[in-house]
């Protein structure tokens, strides 16, 4: 019996470990794409509607902020898209980008820690373009530091959920 | 105040050229497209193509392609639209029109004509 | 190639009387429509964009609505100067146009 209580006081010890880990998954407010043809940071997310969650991170200011020192996976995902409907490309020729940039308030500094994308031919004799960027790393992050978004040509952001998102979720601890 | 004021009313005999001009004023011309529209007597407006004033970029009507070339002058703000090959069916007004979308600020443009020309009368007759 | 048609071709109210006129478009076109007045010798004016978007310096009298395929523009007070033909546009298609006159 002894050895029962034990086991379930050790799981229940893992359990509340594993809430407590750190996580965020952010999904874009279609209602405030900024504008720009060039790189611009996105700063409206959605934390807690539809697949949108956080736990122990704060979003603030458009910006994902670490609370626990640790080794985190960092992933966004950014779809391009535009329909004949909506009018025509002012170009043919795209580059269509994404940056996941890591701000440190302590020692004043950003570096970019992941980008991707392509440059695209969107030929106007197309109804309909479409292009997916997906990237994801494994970063040391301290307690305080930011993490933002920044893409090229938001006015051709798919604004669905599941399209246009990033997120975090703590692996380990820094030893 | 944003105006366009095009050039004015050409007559000419079928087979010829004509090239309308409009001129821009009150907004950076560079950020937006330029469009011509026309009206025969009795018909639908109708949309015949479009000019990126900032890189030149242009894109036309199928019906068009071939005979119609539009030009810009970034320097003296103005664009310019010449049909070829002319035929009694190209009598028309024939507007200038500025797209609404500010090429600053994204790369669609979303035929919102916010501003127009007063038009320019082109008849053609033998 | 959407079509843009509009009903009807004309029409004659009195003024103070409500107008609406519609536009359908032959596929799906979303909020994409436009509104034009067109007066004889005089530049088109845009009334309203996006379906229900009010251009700025355009009398509160001219309303927009629908999405989809199908539209309409309300003048909910025809004043003697709305005496014009009125157009629906989507991207490179307008409709046909609709004359309004006074009774």
């Known amino acids: 019996e002894k050895a029962m209580v034990d086991g379930s006081w050790l799981d229940l010890a893992k359990r509340s470990k594993l809430e407590a880990q750190p996580f965020a998954h952010l999904t874009i407010n279609a209602t405030d794409i900024p504008s720009g043809s060039h790189k611009v940071s996105l700063s409206s997310w959605y934390h807690d509607r539809g697949w949108a969650k956080i736990s122990n991170m704060t979003f603030s200011n458009g910006k994902l902020i670490v609370n626990q020192d640790g080794f985190y996976y960092l992933y966004a995902n950014i779809c391009f898209r535009h329909h004949e409907t909506s009018g025509d490309l002012a170009t043919e020729y795209l580059q269509l980008m994404v940056y996941v940039t890591k701000t440190s308030i302590k020692i004043p500094s950003s570096h970019t820690l992941m980008k991707g994308g392509s440059t695209k031919y969107w030929s106007g004799n197309s109804e309909f373009h479409f292009y997916s960027i997906n990237v994801g790393g494994f970063f040391k992050l301290r307690s305080g530091e930011e993490i933002s978004i920044e893409v090229s040509n938001p006015s051709l952001l798919d604004p669905d959920q599941d399209a246009t998102y990033f997120g975090a979720f703590k692996v380990r601890d820094i030893d | 105040q944003v105006q366009l004021v095009q050039s004015g009313a050409e007559v000419r005999k079928p087979g010829a050229s004509v090239k309308v001009s409009c001129k821009a004023s009150?907004?950076?011309?560079?950020?937006?497209?330029i469009h011509w529209v026309r009206q025969a007597p009795g018909q639908r407006l109708e949309w015949m193509g479009w000019?990126?004033?900032?890189?030149?970029?242009?894109k036309f009507s199928q019906k068009f392609q071939g005979r119609i070339t539009v030009t810009r002058d970034t320097a003296a703000s103005t664009a310019y639209m010449e049909l070829r090959s002319l035929r009694s069916e190209d009598t028309a007004v024939y507007y200038c029109a500025r797209d609404s979308s500010n090429m600053a600020r994204g790369i669609i443009i979303a035929y919102y004509f916010d501003y127009w020309g007063q038009g320019t009368l082109v008849t053609v007759s033998s | 190639e959407i079509v843009m048609t509009q009903s009807p071709s004309s029409l004659s109210a009195s003024v103070g009387d409500r107008v609406t006129i519609t536009c359908r478009a032959s596929?799906?076109?979303?909020?994409?429509l436009n509104w034009y007045q067109l007066k004889p010798g005089k530049a088109p004016r845009l009334l309203i964009y996006?379906?229900?978007s009010l251009q700025s310096g355009v009398p509160s009298r001219f309303s927009g609505s629908g999405s989809g395929a199908e539209f309409t523009l309300t003048i909910s007070s025809l004043q003697p100067e709305d005496i014009a033909t009125y157009y629906c546009q989507h991207t490179r298609a307008f409709g046909q146009g609709t004359k309004v006159e006074i009774k």
């Open positions: 596929q799906s076109i979303s909020r994409y």
């Open positions: 000019i990126n004033a900032g890189n030149g970029n242009t």
């Open positions: 009150g907004y950076d011309f560079s950020n937006y497209a």
């Open positions: 996006g379906a229900s």
